[in-house]
């Protein structure tokens, strides 16, 4: 666990002709304030969730007039840093964006009107632990300049933040295997384990020994999805003892989306489908131009040269949304096999395989009877990720351990009695019948109606079927 | 690396036909789940038919009996064979695949797109 650390500089205009307007004026005072959103991995195509690592919003900014006639000078801060606390590794690469947005503060009806100033985006290597790194990005004609940093949280140390740091126990040296913590040269690395089959990809722990889960998974070693199937509503809070969704208000009461746009819910919270030239998370951003760079995911914008005219964005396989911030539900092709459930991750799609299949895509059987033995000759059987035995005559069962009584299906036709046999059953017919089964009637004239009666065998004497 | 190739899309009346074809084409050891996608103006991309991972076919409720997909292994391809095209299917139409390279890895793939408008 730690926390990612941004300090804004400045905001202001970039070098060059073309000094941006002041975004405040006199009639319409307004401040400054930021947000920032971090992805793992140095792909923005990587990322699980809009902001898988987390995501900060900066207090307010103090409240800025134009002078009149005076050039757009940097833009009054904000105080104090943005912090992204992350629970899991810091993964040494990731992408950020960084939001500036303007509270109007005039006399609007209904309170203050954000818009957004600028955004950008990068992608960037970082070890935690080490100095603010310094970077200064240009949105458009403004630029902005800034430090990061990610750090750890004690007691974990290292350049991911996976090492556990612990007060040494004696003065002298660490225990076996653990070596001393950097730069904490008085404490010991300390083995973090967590509980005994705790996912790896759906739970973690901070103390040895326990198993926390990540949003949408629930149960002891976190290996159960949140399910809303059995539920009545889906929604509210989790409960992680039935892994139901327990009712609570709807995040789309009331309609949150602004200018048009629709709400829609989902497992977390609501989206908004804003309309063209709207975006944000409740579409209440507009006047966006494609110098803003409002298209996500690769998207190539088009159009939108100044506020008054839309902008388009042209996703790229696999994202939709007039941003391209949406990634198509790829699982709706169903790709798993034998029942698996489909994931998708963003950079992949994962299947969760039924008992008795495995691989990507739970194309591969396991060998069900791997192990398992048949009793009194049977042979096992696969399919469907479970075995069964095919049993020799006179046996029966799961494992072909229970003796058959050959007689238990009444073999023998036009009442014929049945006598269980040490290699089979035997059928005694009635009189006007033959054969092993006594299915062939016997004629009056003494001629059976198919086969004749092996010799030495008359009519109605036993058979013995083999 | 593998490409899907979308053709046969057009301008047709309300009531008419279209065959749309994808053909996959690179590295590929296997297909695993092919078909057809497609996203209207303002709307989001949805499944319109597909072969499942286990072969199984798969049709949006809004083209059951009026769509049909099939395919040809030994070439790659899909077929969306679209009959009494309404004026609510004019999209862009995706070829999906989900296949797996010969490093045995599976990866997703969306094709370019082609374009139906169904108008009078």
């Known amino acids: 666990a730690g926390v990612f650390e941004l300090q804004i500089h400045s905001f202001g205009p970039g070098p060059g002709p073309g000094a941006p307007r002041s975004p405040c004026s006199a009639r319409l005072p307004c401040r400054l304030f930021f947000r920032v959103c971090l992805k793992p991995g140095l792909s923005e195509e990587a990322a699980e969730s809009p902001c898988a690592l987390g995501a900060a919003l900066s207090a307010r900014g103090p409240v800025y007039t134009e002078q009149p006639g005076a050039p757009a000078p940097d833009l009054p801060l904000p105080d104090g840093l943005l912090q992204v606390p992350f629970r899991d590794a810091w993964p040494g690469t990731f992408s950020f964006i960084i939001e500036t947005w303007r509270e109007e503060l005039g006399d609007q009806i209904g309170g203050p009107a954000w818009s957004l100033l600028a955004r950008v985006a990068g992608r960037r290597r970082l070890a935690a632990g080490g100095p603010w790194a310094r970077d200064i990005q240009r949105a458009g004609a403004w630029e902005l300049r800034f430090s990061y940093r990610a750090r750890c949280e004690p007691p974990a140390v290292g350049t991911a933040c996976t090492r556990l740091c612990r007060p040494r126990s004696a003065p002298s040296r660490c225990g076996p295997g653990l070596r001393p913590c950097a730069p904490l040269e008085d404490e010991c690395e300390a083995p973090l384990v967590c509980r005994a089959g705790c996912s790896p990809e759906h739970g973690f722990c901070e103390q040895p020994g326990e198993c926390r889960c990540l949003e949408g998974w629930t149960g002891p070693l976190c290996t159960v999805p949140v399910s809303t199937s059995s539920c009545l509503s889906p929604r509210g809070p989790s409960s992680a003892t039935t892994g139901c969704l327990v009712p609570g208000p709807g995040p789309c009461d009331g309609n949150p989306c602004a200018n048009g746009g629709s709400c829609s819910e989902t497992p977390r919270s609501f989206e908004c489908t804003c309309p063209r030239g709207f975006y944000g998370l409740r579409c209440e951003v507009s006047g966006v131009t494609c110098a803003d760079g409002p298209c996500f995911n690769g998207g190539l914008c088009v159009g939108g040269a100044d506020p008054d005219s839309a902008y388009i964005c042209h996703c790229p396989p696999g994202f939709q949304g007039s941003n391209c911030e949406k990634r198509v539900d790829r699982c709706s092709l169903q790709p798993c096999r034998n029942g698996g459930l489909c994931l998708d991750l963003g950079h992949a799609l994962r299947c969760r395989c039924r008992a008795g299949f495995a691989g990507p895509r739970c194309e591969h059987d396991l060998d069900d009877c791997a192990g398992r033995a048949c009793a009194n000759g049977g042979t096992c059987v696969e399919g469907g990720g479970a075995h069964r035995c095919s049993c020799a005559l006179g046996f029966g069962g799961r494992d072909c351990r229970e003796r058959a009584d050959p007689c238990a299906a009444r073999p023998c036709a036009h009442g014929g009695r049945c006598y269980a046999h040490f290699s089979g059953l035997v059928c005694a017919c009635a009189p006007g019948y033959m054969g092993a089964r006594c299915e062939f009637p016997v004629h009056p004239d003494g001629a059976s109606a198919l086969p004749a009666a092996p010799p030495g065998l008359r009519p109605g004497d036993p058979q013995r079927y083999l | 690396e593998v490409q899907l190739v979308e053709s046969g899309g057009g301008e047709v009346q309300p009531g008419g036909s279209l065959r749309l074809s994808c053909a996959a084409s690179?590295?590929?050891?296997?297909?695993?789940?092919m078909g057809w996608y497609r996203q209207a103006p303002g709307k989001q991309r949805e499944l319109v038919a597909g072969f499942t991972g286990d072969t199984n076919t798969i049709y949006a409720e809004s083209v059951k009996g009026r769509f049909t997909i099939s395919r040809d292994n030994a070439k790659n391809t899909v077929y969306l064979q679209m009959s009494s095209l309404r004026a609510e299917d004019t999209a862009v139409y995706y070829c999906a695949a989900d296949v797996q390279l010969f490093s045995r890895d599976y990866e997703f793939y969306w094709g370019q797109g082609t374009l139906v408008t169904v108008k009078p």
């Open positions: 690179g590295s590929i050891f296997s297909i695993n789940a």
